[in-house]
């Protein structure tokens, strides 16, 4: 069975084809090759002789037991080598020779028992080494790591490391890898020698499900003293053994670390006193809790020095009390409990993401809701009912505003966005908005992107509501049940590049409303009911137009519409997916491609 | 279509069939078997995925006695610092995991419950597997 040609001459997918040897009929130009799940078993020298251009090679689950010297010799362009799930028993010293450009080596679940004997010391370009899910017992980083000066990610998770000693990290003292991210999760740790991490700098350290008791966690965290880490991730996994007890003493040792960003990811434990618990983390710049349950919500009004707070997938009794002077970014998403938003006091806040919480807002939106006048980014998408009762007083700095899939009330009663002169991006898609007021978008003089799909218009008619949006480049009006539009609806949109009118109820096509769109490149009219043209003579679309989508419409392939069908053929160079432009009527032509029709109409007496 | 039996409990019988062409082997055990009146137990899964599990989600299509419920999307793996350790599993890596579950106080009426589970993962998104579970429910008491 042949391999699947994904990108001709470049990418070949040969997964699970029961190959016992490397295929010899693929072009020399192949760059990406997936040979996973084939019983190759043995890689001799120059196994990839015929693939001089190879950049990505996936050998996952190929039952490889032996890799000989020079197996990958000649793959000087290879950047990614994946060996996941191979039961390697014999790995020659020169197994990886010739890989002078390798950046990513994945040797997950390959029976690797030690880093010491892993022959990768010459791979100077290596950025990512993933040796998770192996049998490694010692965390001693071999001397050859001093050659791996580009290493950024080392994944040692799910191994058998129990102890970390001062000598294990000696090589990092010799050549501080300023950018190294280290994942030690799911190793059964019980001892970290104090001083082992002294004066070590890491970009990221992840320790999840490493400790089987509170005491072990406490002493191991104390053993991290002296570490300088940009981002520290602690926590557990839902499907692994969890700590029975967790209290403030667990994290006391963090006072002896220098941490820029902290994240606690999943804890099967109720956090009550977060002020005491995170006492050592009051001055980290970014603080993040993922999938934890928080009892006392008032604690977030303590004087923490955080600049970024992230609360994701957490459980709260009620919406937390947030009073944080220095906070610039708040991400509060996919949380449960506390369905009603209550005011927060965050005077420095610039970025606020409150999406996917099922929250309802009694009144939105003004500076008093968020306690700031500095807000530039506000995401309230995928929430409940949001009642628009204020026109963003004090929030004039806003540049990005997203309400999609929330239920907006009172949108068509006044110019809600009147004061948002700096707004660049607005998404009100699927917000149950019924446009019945022409001034709905007044004030949005800087707006570049407007997404309003899935809403509706009075009498299914698009009026002149865009008159002030002179900088608009992207407009999505899909799924709005539109049947007609004002001939001057788009007259002021001279910068518009993309217009999506798909999934509406237009029965005819007219070029007139687009005559002023001098920058229009993409016009999508797919999934309407277009049968013919509105006027007998259709003009040309703007000369800037490059893509016109008329697929999945109800074209009437009859003589009376011959001029329209001819016009469509004349637009051939603009049309996309022409094979999906089919006749709907008459029945004998149903399903026929419009462009292949040859309608010769004669006047039959 | 070959049917794979999972388990029987006092009020339910659970089995599944594959609803995709690939039919990559997956082993599913429930201990103790689910009782629809109330249940607490462990779900054990052994599986070798054909793509990374990063950003795994399930599309659930549930049918109750021939009545179709709306499609439900259950996100399991968001893509970073996920709740489940198997979210970091790579294509070809053994997934051997136990997940605890519990629910109570749901009253199910007697009949045949079907649940098509479409597992989607990776970037670009592709189907990982598709299983159609059939639960025959015979409550002892209403």
């Amino acid at each position: 069975e042949p391999c699947v040609e994904v990108v001709p001459n470049i990418t070949y997918q040969c997964m699970e084809l029961n190959f016992y040897k490397i295929p010899d009929n693929l072009p020399f130009s192949t760059k990406n090759l997936d040979l996973s799940f084939n019983p190759l078993r043995h890689l001799g020298s120059y196994s990839f002789f015929s693939f001089p251009e190879l950049q990505v090679l996936d050998l996952s689950r190929c039952e490889i037991q032996t890799i000989e010297d020079g197996a990958y010799q000649s793959l000087s362009h290879l950047s990614t080598l994946i060996l996941t799930g191979n039961p390697i028993q014999s790995l020659a010293l020169g197994a990886f020779s010739g890989l002078s450009s390798l950046q990513k080596l994945v040797a997950v679940e390959t029976n690797l028992a030690s880093l010491e004997n892993f022959p990768i010391g010459h791979l100077k370009t290596l950025k990512e080494l993933n040796v998770a899910h192996n049998l490694i017992q010692s965390f001693k980083l071999p001397e050859y790591f001093s050659n791996l000066t580009n290493l950024e990610h080392l994944d040692l998770s799910s191994n058998k490391i129990q102890s970390i000693y001062c000598t294990d990290l000696r090589v990092l003292h010799q050549m501080p890898l300023l950018n190294l991210s280290l994942d030690l999760s799911l190793n059964p740790m019980n001892f970290i020698q104090p001083g082992a991490f002294k004066e070590i700098r890491l970009h990221k350290l992840t320790l999840r499900n490493n400790f089987d008791s509170l005491n072990v966690m406490k002493t191991c965290i104390q053993g991290l003293a002296g570490l300088e880490v940009h981002r520290l991730v602690l926590g557990e996994f839902r499907n692994e053994g969890n700590l029975e007890k967790f209290d403030k003493s667990a994290l006391e040792g963090l006072c002896n670390l220098t941490i820029e960003e902290f994240r606690l990811a999943y804890l099967d434990y109720y956090l009550d006193d977060i002020i005491d618990l995170f006492n050592c983390l009051t001055n980290v710049s970014s603080f993040s809790l993922v999938s934890v349950t928080i009892e006392r919500v008032k604690d977030f009004s303590y004087n923490f020095g955080w600049q970024h707070l992230e609360l994701v997938n957490c459980k709260f009794g009620q919406f937390p009390t947030l009073k944080l002077k220095s906070l610039k970014r708040l991400t509060f998403t996919s949380n449960k409990g506390g369905n009603a938003f209550s005011e927060v006091d965050l005077p420095s806040l610039e970025f606020l993401d409150l999406s996917r919480n099922g929250l309802s807002f009694k009144g939105c939106c003004s500076q008093s809701d968020f306690g700031t006048t500095s807000l530039k980014y506000l995401d309230l998408s995928f929430n409940g009912v949001i009642t628009m009762s204020s026109n963003f007083l004090g929030l004039e700095q806003l540049e990005h505003l997203d309400f999609q899939h929330s239920n907006l009330k009172q949108m068509s009663e006044f110019s809600v966005f009147l004061s948002l002169r700096n707004l660049i991006y607005l998404d009100i898609s699927h917000t149950h908005t019924r446009v019945a007021f022409n001034g709905i978008f007044n004030g949005l003089s800087s707006l570049e992107v407007l997404k309003m799909a899935g809403n509706s218009f009075q009498e299914n008619f698009l009026p002149d509501i865009f008159t002030e949006l002179r900088n608009l480049t992207f407009l999505d009006l899909s799924q709005c049940q539109l049947e007609q539009l004002s001939p001057t609806a788009f007259n002021s949109l001279s910068s518009l590049q993309v217009l999506n009118m798909s999934h509406n109820n237009f029965f005819s096509l007219d070029t007139f409303p687009y005559k002023c769109l001098n920058s229009l490149q993409v016009l999508d009219y797919s999934l309407n009911h277009i049968m013919t043209s509105k006027k007998q003579e259709l003009q040309h679309f703007p000369s800037s137009l490059a893509f016109l989508n008329l697929t999945q419409n109800d074209f009437a392939c009859t003589c009376e519409h011959q001029s329209f069908l001819q016009w469509i053929k004349d637009q051939r160079q603009l049309l996309v997916e022409v094979e999906r432009m089919e006749c709907a009527t008459p029945s004998d032509k149903q399903g026929m491609p419009v462009l292949s029709l040859n309608i010769t109409c004669q006047m039959n007496k | 279509q070959k049917q794979y039996w999972v388990c029987n409990s006092s009020d339910a019988s659970i089995s599944y069939t594959y609803c995709d062409k690939m039919q990559y082997p997956i082993s599913i055990n429930v201990n103790p078997c689910i009782e629809l009146k109330r249940s607490k137990g462990l779900l054990h899964i052994f599986y070798i995925p054909r793509r990374d599990l990063k950003q795994l989600y399930f599309n659930l299509y549930i049918t109750v006695n021939t009545m179709n419920l709306p499609k439900r999307k259950e996100v399991i793996c968001r893509g970073s610092d996920d709740d489940y350790s198997f979210c970091r599993a790579l294509k070809g890596e053994t997934v051997n995991t136990t997940i605890s579950f519990s629910f109570k106080g749901i009253k199910f009426s007697k009949g045949k419950y079907k649940c098509v589970v479409e597992a989607i993962s990776g970037s670009p998104e592709e189907m990982l597997f598709c299983l159609e579970f059939v639960i025959l429910h015979q409550p002892n008491s209403n």
């Epitope: 040897k21 010899d24 020399f28 001799g44 020298s45 120059y46 002789f49 | -």
Partner: nanobody
């Protein structure tokens, strides 16, 4: 078993030309691809050019594109490498290699090419 014998190497001035030959014998029916590699002192062996016996498709390393030409004469079981506009950095031992369907790679003994004024 496949035997490969190279010839045609030597000393040449920058800008000059050489033509290398590689004669194959033995189980030549099993050969899929043939090619030329080179190894400069202290460096790893690298691809120069490849040719597929079945359909004649060809590959050249970027460093020799437009200067070197690989060709084959099936009747003589020989592969050639025509090297024009030679540069000092082309100095190396040039090896002929053949890849069979077994899969196995056979090598010639190598021929020295020196580009120097």
């Amino acid at each position: 078993e496949v035997q490969l014998v190279e010839s045609g190497g030597g000393l040449v001035q920058p800008g000059g030309s050489l033509r290398l030959s590689c004669a194959a014998s033995g189980s030549i029916f099993s050969i899929n691809d043939m090619g030329w590699f080179r190894q400069a002192p202290g460096k790893e062996r690298e691809h120069v050019a490849l040719i597929r016996i079945k359909d004649g498709s060809i590959y050249y390393a970027d460093s020799v594109k437009g200067r070197f030409t690989i060709s084959r004469d099936n009747a003589k079981n020989t592969v050639y490498l025509q090297m024009n506009s030679l540069k000092p950095e082309d100095t190396a031992v040039y090896y002929c290699a053949a890849k069979t369907g077994t899969p196995f790679v056979y090598w010639g003994q190598g021929t020295q090419v020196t580009v120097s004024s």
